[in-house]
Interface confidence: medium
């Protein structure tokens, strides 16, 4: 698989980690999260051309079949390969609690 | 998350398991795989409308941000949640070997 910078579509256009700033209101969390009031959401965005960051055998198959049957089989999709944990301070019935979420922020990306 | 049959876009249009028949030639495997000569490839295809089969918190965030910034943040994508193993009989330098691939056939799907 090509490395992350070797995008045949041009620099930065292939599957990679992006950061999107979002408020609690944007996320629909304002009524249950106290802090942070703004989240730097890391997510996987970009195209998955042939064999670029292919996650596994399934991704390779998908690429091959997409070439043959583009109307039936979609191209692989840029999704998180792993996550970074994030702590939220949230409201509870009895007060406030710290909660760690392991599946909230993308850490790195691949195509599948 | 809604269950697999509760697709707001109409029956069968949301993220679910599909089977695509593919030959070794289709997959580009003809020179190293002996058998099977045809594979029933199970893969995840379909739309991921709001919270449909959301895999985790990240998928929920992605849905919210896609609504706000559709040109920047893509909708969640339909990908395998788990895989079924598949045995391939492949040619090796010394003869023929049985190889089990754990990441070849999608078993079930979710949106992420």
């Amino acid at each position: 698989a090509r490395n992350g910078d070797d995008c045949p579509l041009g620099p930065g256009r292939c599957c990679r980690l992006h950061t999107v700033r979002a408020s609690l209101e944007d996320l629909g969390w304002a009524d249950w999260v106290l802090s942070p009031r703004e989240v730097q959401v890391t997510m996987c965005i970009g195209a998955c051309p042939s064999q670029f960051r292919a996650a596994n055998m399934h991704a390779q198959i998908k690429t091959s079949l997409h070439r043959l049957k583009p109307d039936t089989v979609p191209a692989p999709c840029c999704v998180p390969a792993s996550y970074n944990p994030m702590v939220l301070i949230q409201k509870t019935d009895t007060g406030v609690s710290l909660q760690t979420y392991d599946d909230l922020l993308a850490k790195d990306c691949h195509c599948i | 998350a809604r269950n697999g049959d509760d697709c707001p876009l109409g029956p069968g249009r949301c993220c679910r398991l599909h089977t695509v028949r593919a030959s070794l030639e289709d997959l580009g495997w003809a020179d190293w795989v002996l058998s099977p000569r045809e594979v029933q490839v199970t893969m995840c295809i379909g739309a991921c409308p709001s919270q449909f089969r959301a895999a985790n918190m990240h998928a929920q965030i992605k849905t919210s941000l896609h609504r706000l910034k559709p040109d920047t943040v893509p909708a969640p994508c339909c990908v395998p949640a788990s895989y079924n193993p598949m045995v391939l009989i492949q040619k090796t330098d010394t003869g023929v070997s049985l190889q089990t691939y754990d990441d070849l056939l999608a078993k079930d799907c979710h949106c992420i």
């Epitope: - | 020179d31 002996l34 058998s35 000569r37 598949m86 049985l98 089990t100």
Partner: antibody, heavy 119, light 111 residues
């Protein structure tokens, strides 16, 4: 260690039915296609039926088509052969075999179970 | 359907001598890349045992005195130096397409 253990054989009258079972162990049953092969007394081997790993592809020899049904229960690691409308020429030792996939070979065989069709 | 015809029906060989068994298919069991022909040995009172797969590939654990060759319609199993434990019936089998078929068998005995 791979093991295939057949059961369910016995004596049955022509026109009768019998259900053979094959209990598999020592490998991931759900990953492998399976077949039944039979051998009439003093005769050669005859392939009977094939079922793919997920049970979606099934093939039969012409001699048993419409009378025999191959099936599997991957949750129980068990292969079955339902035999209806039995004929005297179905008398044989029935072997459960691991067939891997289509276009493959039989790499493991059970010890066989004997089916006798006689009036 | 591809009918497999084995020859000879039986073979008596002296210990240490070479044995050759032939299998002819009524139509090709090969593709441009592979031959879907396999060989089995069956000893008295036992289930068959795989010897050779895809015409020429030795199954793991099988002595290298066994070898297979051929393509298309004509295939051969050879035992370079026959040993006492090689007594039994040998079958060819194709898996080019369904229905899979076996040859009629060749009985190998010690002279």
């Amino acid at each position: 260690e791979v093991q295939l253990v057949e059961s369910g054989g016995g004596l049955v009258k022509p026109g009768g039915s019998l259900r053979l079972s094959c209990a598999a162990s020592g490998f991931t049953f759900s990953s492998y296609a399976m077949s039944w092969v039979r051998q009439a007394p003093g005769k050669g081997l005859e392939w009977v039926a094939y079922i793919s790993s997920g049970g979606d592809n099934i093939y039969y020899a012409d001699t048993v088509k419409g009378r025999f049904t191959i099936s599997r229960d991957n949750s129980k690691n068990t292969l079955y052969l339902q035999m209806n409308s039995l004929k005297t020429e179905d008398t044989a030792v029935y072997y459960c075999t691991r067939a891997l996939v289509e276009n493959a070979y039989f790499d493991y065989w059970g010890q066989g179970t004997t089916v006798t069709v006689s009036s | 359907d591809s009918v497999l015809t084995q020859s000879p029906d039986s073979l008596a060989v002296s210990l240490g001598e070479r044995a050759t068994i032939n299998c002819r298919a009524s139509k090709s069991v090969s593709t441009s890349t592979y031959s879907y022909m396999h060989w089995y040995q069956q000893k008295p009172g036992q289930p068959p045992k795989l010897l050779i797969k895809y015409a020429s590939y030795l199954e793991s654990g099988v002595p290298d005195r066994f070898s297979g060759s051929g393509s298309g319609t004509d295939f051969t199993l050879k035992i370079s130096r026959v040993e006492a434990e090689d007594v039994g019936v040998y079958y060819c089998q194709h898996s080019r397409e369904f229905p899979w078929t076996f040859g009629g068998g060749t009985k190998v005995e010690i002279k």
